[in-house]
Interface confidence: low
């Protein structure tokens, strides 16, 4: 090989020995019959050399800098030339570093030929293994701007007191062009400005200077961003970190088209702004650290661009200004991401603040729009506390559990509407009345409606699920003992059509002991099935639930057990099942750790099945099924 | 208080699926990262992966991507993670982890779930 | 990837001396480093995050230092509790790698 500077050139050649490996052989460079494992050569030098193994690339790399000095006379602006020719060179790893020195009132700007750049994080590498390193420099200290791969967005980054700009080519790239031309510009007065430009829908991950270490103190860097009119943009933030500020606050600052209030200014905790449509700039300001405790400031964003989807232009009004304890989340729908773009799906707040998900509060009248590819990728979870604080005040009061019409317009998918129902404690219990009687979803016989009620205790140390409920069976009423909290879930799309079903009034009742009862009106011929609370985990330890079941005159029911032992061991305490006549009294005792299920009885009156769980060992648990079927008297029952 | 409940014990056969659950406790689910992390038997710790529990987005380590799927039910604070064509070297206990943002430190983790693939 | 080194891989001490336990990044990870201890049958516990800072509810005999590539774990005075696994944890970026571990028993 050989390698010839020209003088003046103020390039400098350096091959040396690379990330050492593990190959057993050494190899050398080899200069009149010299083994050296380093070779520089300087501007106005000829070297010949060759190496002493056949595969140089697994052992040496070749680092090209040059050297461009804009403080002492004209700066050669225009394309930049690899020099020398790739051609000419070695197959090895090759860096070529352009060093610019300017004075501080020079702004310098790098432009990228297509294709344009795109911005990798650290332990990232490119796929093609080219790969651009820029840095500036603040007074003698080194910024760095960023690592970029091909392939991307940014078109020109613009800085001022020099740049340091770092091509790294792997051995096999055959690429002999550098792909940018440096332009001398005004000052810019700020660290950098990178432009970003996007001809169709995309994203682009961007950072911060020196990221991830901290941005310069009290710095200022300027993105900005190039977007097609008929698209809409939206920023989000992946991550960041805030320094401790002794003086100013640290901030980004957007100029949006159209803004009135231009800069708008959010600290990074914000909620970013989305549904941008056209060009806008981003600014990200340092403070003044603390000396003793400076910490850092960093910031990792993404910028989504798409095309504004038909929702995007309507404004929905969600009136919860006379609600109380109320809040409304709009949210993805938990999916499996997929590998390839997906366009953002976002909730605006007054069509400018936008994000993956939104909570709405009781007490204001909100104004949303959406900006989203497919609604279906959204649903809505509501909360609603009904409370009572004072026992005198509430007592037989009612509420209407339903879905307020507001909620149902909007064209997003309801999840989940949660109402926490709470009473002072010893004082109050509750009833849930259903506009249409329910039945219990059970393996045996599940719901098949659009939606179903949850009902569950709502104390915090208490894990009790009384069951999921749906219209269209035979529960008439269920009083609970204490707080709980009720959640309409939604199945399928057709709960809007099914809406009018739904319909629960809660009232608040006189205090009772048991955790417990439901009222049972079976409807002749349909088979009941009923199971205790906690199905899946047991009865909680020491708690009692009733079910209070209604016999018509002419009808005679059948209470069947399916299983033969309740399977229950208790540590302390008995269980027990009682079953009572409500006619004349008379009741049954079942120990339901010791003896066995009763077989199918017939019962020709209304009757109570209560059930009492111990202090159960654990694995050993309390789980009963049972089911009445109503058959008119005259059949012959032997 | 903060709490990791993750599901009990797995034994399973090559080729079947198993599917880990770590249910969230005591904070907002959707606040923080959760992390997989795997131990084999007598070995070390290796991270598997993250999803983001705000938008359920997961990233995966190299060596955990095509049979393993980390997914969420935010409306029950649950993480689960999913293994499908189970192998004998998946034999190890699998830790769900809380973490912060894009460079976590684990503060909490689930009592771990010991799942056996053997014939 | 980040390759985490530690060494050494078993430290015998006993009660009151003093643990240096280290750990090498295969590049620089600035202060993305966070160290956990494990022991037998239990999940690992959080002792220091971004390589110094220390957690509440851990012991101040337990310290952090180093930036870059080069970390230090130092329990100033061993109690008989600390004899388990050591991790170190890079943070830096995907995928977060662990180190192999120390074990610190008891000699």
């Known amino acids: 090989f050989e390698i010839a500077l020209p003088r003046e050139s103020n390039i400098t050649v350096l091959i040396k020995l690379g990330t050492p490996t593990l190959l057993a052989k050494p190899c050398y460079i080899v200069i009149s019959k010299r083994h050296i494992t380093m070779l520089s050569i300087k501007s106005g030098e000829r070297i010949v050399f060759t190496f002493s193994c056949q595969s140089p690339e697994n052992h040496f790399v070749i680092e090209i800098q040059k050297n461009i000095d804009c403080m002492s006379g004209p700066c050669p602006f225009g394309e930049v030339q690899l020099q020398p020719s790739t051609s000419l060179l070695p197959t090895l790893n090759r860096t070529f570093i352009w060093d610019v020195k300017a004075h501080k009132s020079i702004g310098l700007e790098l432009q990228f030929s297509i294709p344009r750049l795109r911005q990798i994080g650290p332990g990232e590498s490119c796929p093609d293994g080219v790969t651009h390193s820029i840095s500036g420099r603040i007074d003698a200290t080194v910024v760095r701007i960023g690592t970029f791969c091909s392939n991307g967005t940014v078109s020109r980054i613009k800085m001022q007191e020099g740049v340091k700009m770092a091509l790294h080519l792997p051995w096999f790239h055959p690429r002999n062009v550098s792909g940018f031309s440096i332009a001398n510009r005004s000052s810019i007065k700020r660290l950098c400005i990178i432009e970003s430009v996007f001809e169709g829908e995309g994203s682009a991950t961007l950072m911060s200077a020196n990221y991830p270490e901290g941005f310069p103190e009290d710095e200022l860097m300027t993105w900005q961003f190039v977007v097609p009119a008929h698209l809409r943009a939206s920023v989000s933030f992946l991550n960041f970190n805030l320094s401790n500020c002794e003086r100013k606050e640290e901030r980004v600052e957007y100029y949006i088209p159209g803004s009135t209030t231009n800069p708008e200014v959010f600290k990074l905790e914000d909620k970013q702004p989305g549904n941008m449509a056209g060009n806008f700039n981003l600014s990200l300001q340092g403070c003044d650290q603390d000396a003793q405790s400076p910490g850092i400031l960093r910031l990792q964003f993404q910028v989504l661009v798409q095309h504004p989807q038909n929702e995007s232009n309507k404004i929905y009004v969600v009136d919860l200004s006379n609600e109380r304890a109320m809040s409304l989340t709009i949210e993805p729908r938990p999916v499996k991401q997929s590998r390839k773009f997906v366009p953002g799906c976002f909730v605006c707040l007054e069509s400018r603040t936008c994000s993956s998900n939104l909570t709405l509060t009781s007490g204001s009248k909100h104004k949303i729009s959406f900006l989203c590819d497919d609604l279906t990728r959204l649903w809505m979870n509501v909360e609603k506390t009904i409370s009572c604080t004072d026992h005198r005040y509430c007592q037989r009061k009612s509420y209407s559990l339903q879905v307020p019409s507001d909620i149902l317009h909007l064209p997003v998918e309801l999840h989940d509407f949660s109402w926490k129902l709470l009473v002072p404690k010893d004082r109050l219990s509750l009833v849930l009345v259903p506009a249409q009687k329910l039945q219990q979803h059970t393996h045996e016989k599940p719901c098949n409606t659009s939606f179903s009620y949850l009902v569950a205790s709502a104390i915090p140390s208490q894990d009790l699920y009384f069951g999921s409920f749906c219209p269209g069976g035979s529960i008439k009423q269920i009083q609970v003992k204490q707080n709980i909290s009720v959640t309409l879930r939604t199945f399928a799309p057709s709960f809007q059509q099914e809406a009018s079903r739904q319909g629960l009034t809660v009232s608040f009742i006189p205090y009772f002991k048991e955790e417990g009862v439901f009222t049972v009106t079976p409807d002749t011929k349909s088979k009941v099935y009923l199971r205790t609370p906690n199905w899946d985990r047991g009865l909680p330890s020491l708690t009692s639930v009733s079910w209070n079941i209604s016999v018509p005159r002419d009808q005679v029911a059948c209470l069947t057990f399916f299983k033969e032992r309740s399977g229950v061991v208790c540590q302390t305490g008995r269980a027990f099942m009682i079953i009572q006549e409500q006619r004349t009294r008379a009741e049954e005792i079942f120990s339901l750790d010791e003896d066995v299920l009763p077989k199918p009885s017939f019962h020709h009156h209304s009757f109570w099945v209560n059930i009492s769980n111990c202090s159960p060992t654990s694995g050993k648990q309390l789980d009963l099924l049972f089911s009445v079927t109503l058959t008119p008297r005259t059949v012959d029952l032997t | 208080q903060v709490q990791l409940v993750q599901s009990g014990s797995e034994l399973k056969k090559p080729g079947e699926s198993v599917k880990v659950s770590c249910k969230a406790s005591g904070y907002t689910l959707t606040d923080f990262s959760m992390h997989w992390v795997r131990q084999a038997p007598g070995q070390g710790l290796e991270w598997m992966g993250w999803?983001?529990?705000?938008?359920?987005?997961?990233t995966y380590a190299d060596d955990f991507k095509g049979r393993f799927v980390l997914s969420l039910d935010t409306s029950v604070s649950t993480a689960y993670l999913q293994i499908s064509s189970l192998k004998s070297e998946d034999t190890a206990v699998y830790y769900c982890?809380?973490?912060?943002?894009?460079?976590?430190?684990?503060?909490?983790w689930g009592q771990g779930t010991l799942v056996t693939v053997s014939s | 990837e980040i390759v985490l080194t530690q060494s050494p891989a078993t430290l015998s001490l006993s009660p009151g001396e003093r643990a240096t336990l280290s750990c090498r990044a295969s590049?620089?990870?600035?202060?993305?480093l966070h160290w956990y201890q494990q022991k037998p049958g239990q999940s690992p516990r959080l002792l220091i995050k971004?390589?110094?800072q220390s957690i509440s509810g851990i012991p101040a005999r337990f310290s952090g230092s180093g930036s870059g590539s080069d970390f230090t774990l130092t329990i100033s005075s061993v109690e008989p509790e600390d004899f388990a696994v050591y991790y170190c944890q890079s943070a830096h970026s995907f995928p977060y790698t662990f180190g192999q571990g120390t074990k610190l028993e008891i000699k």
């Open positions: 982890s809380r973490g912060r943002d894009y460079d976590p430190h684990f503060d909490y």
């Open positions: 971004y390589a110094s």
């Open positions: 590049q620089s990870i600035s202060d993305f």
């Open positions: 999803i983001n529990t705000e938008t359920g987005a997961p």
